[in-house]
């Protein structure tokens, strides 16, 4: 029997064992987080699947993910939201130590999808494990990109108090308007709920003593945020290794000096 024709995309296909992975992650998350014990993981998977299965994978919309967002609704306490841009690993290492702060990937929906790829095919109930649309080469309205845009928008919209963002000081554009942070989250912080955005610029080189808070792209971020009536603060994190160590052991004598 000849295999049925399948759309070829430029990106890698759906992550192996995607349904099992999502379900297993959901069960694990709800076991570890008492406030989410009421979540029915089968319903969550059904809503996740419903967002992209049998739909043309270059025509996915935010609306498609709203049922999943509805089931995964979670609140972060004020002052406890940590956004990040191009420095995911350090942000996650930080919240693993500072347990009362949360990145998107510490929330149920972000946790379910972190590092996974998925897509379906128009008019079939199959998942495409061969290839999925690439954001640049194929289309931006693909299942993965739209998912992250949707949940990132919601995460920013619900933030309150002082919001923190970790930025990568080693990149040519420390603040990139085209990143998810720059294109989605910045514009969805609610001025009536968010008093300030505090940027932590993470230095890469050990001998780098420049004040990266004076970088032109940081000034651009400050301008965008200030125009939205949200105060802006910036801190250099010169030694990320020491920074993490001091989060773990704040009483350490070396932590009294700058990091």
């Amino acid at each position: 029997v000849l295999p049925r024709w399948r759309q070829q995309w430029s990106g890698s296909g759906t992550t192996s064992r995607f349904p099992e992975t999502v379900l297993a992650r959901c069960v694990k998350y709800t076991e570890v987080h008492p406030e989410m014990r009421h979540v029915d993981c089968q319903s969550v998977w059904d809503a996740f699947k419903g967002a992209f299965i049998s739909k043309y994978p270059c025509n996915i919309t935010e609306e498609d993910y709203q049922p999943l967002v509805k089931l995964g609704t979670q609140t972060v306490p004020c002052n406890k939201t940590l956004l990040w841009s191009r420095i995911k690993d350090l942000a996650h290492q930080f919240t693993q130590v500072q347990r009362d702060m949360f990145t998107l990937e510490d929330m149920l929906l972000g946790y379910l999808a972190d590092d996974l790829t998925w897509c379906g095919e128009f008019n079939t109930f199959e998942i495409n494990y061969q290839s999925c649309p690439d954001w640049r080469k194929d289309c931006s309205n693909n299942p993965v990109s739209v998912f992250w845009k949707t949940v990132s928008r919601r995460f920013a919209e619900t933030a309150c108090g002082v919001v923190h963002v970790m930025l990568n000081g080693s990149r040519s554009k420390i603040f990139d308007k085209n990143s998810t942070f720059g294109s989605v989250e910045v514009h969805n912080l609610q001025p009536e709920k968010v008093q300030a955005l505090e940027a932590w610029v993470i230095h890469g080189g050990r001998e780098d003593s420049r004040d990266l808070c004076q970088d032109p792209t940081i000034k651009e971020l400050e301008s965008i945020i200030s125009k939205r009536n949200i105060r802006f603060f910036c801190k250099n994190i010169y030694r990320p290794d020491k920074f993490l160590q001091c989060v773990k052991n704040p009483e350490d004598s070396s932590c009294l000096s700058g990091i």
Epitope: S43, E62, E63, Q66, P67, V69, K70, L71
Partner: antibody, heavy 119, light 107 residues
Amino acid sequence: EVQLLESGGDLVQPGGSLRLSCGASGFTFSDHYMSWVRQAPGKGLEWVADISARGSNTWYADSVKGRFTISRDNSENTLYLQMNSLRAEDTAVYYCAKNWNYNYGMDVWGQGTTVTVSS
Amino acid sequence: QSVLTQAPSASGTPGQRVTISCSGSSIQNNYVSWYQQLPGTAPKLLIYRNFERPSGVPDRFSASKSGTSASLAISGLQSGDEADYYCASWDDSLNWVFGGGTKLTVL
């Protein structure tokens, strides 16, 4: 034929209770989110409550939160609305409706059952 | 107070094209559906998922959505189209919300 049939509407005194039922036929009831929507005399439609396909999640309008409870029995293909602490402003025709793929729209409606709250 | 705003009334003569609008911030990221309620009857789904028609709904009924507003167009107006028309969507809390309704009169 796809059908929803409400029952249980009545005249009840303020502070009283009532349970509405909605029987479903012609579709796989357990696959669909369901809603209750009401319409006060001469007024527009007002969403009241939703329940997920498996019954594990429920959502309510602020106006009924803490007083009304939506539930379902998938083995009996029946949707319920338990209404307690009824007020005059709860007087309305109550419709049950099937949700098409969560948020596409409400594609099947019952004929409605009338609840009157008055002393 | 509904977060979806509709004009209370609209009118047209037989054969004409009329448009009913619906606006609200939650429309931007949520599907819009449209319902027709003939006098003394239950609502009926006319449009789902912003612009799609269920089978059995004539193609005289069409809809569109742009940004925070949506509209329903009825062409070739007939006396039988006289009814109340409601838009619906999910609100910012991801719960259903209906517009206040537009009463369509065929002159």
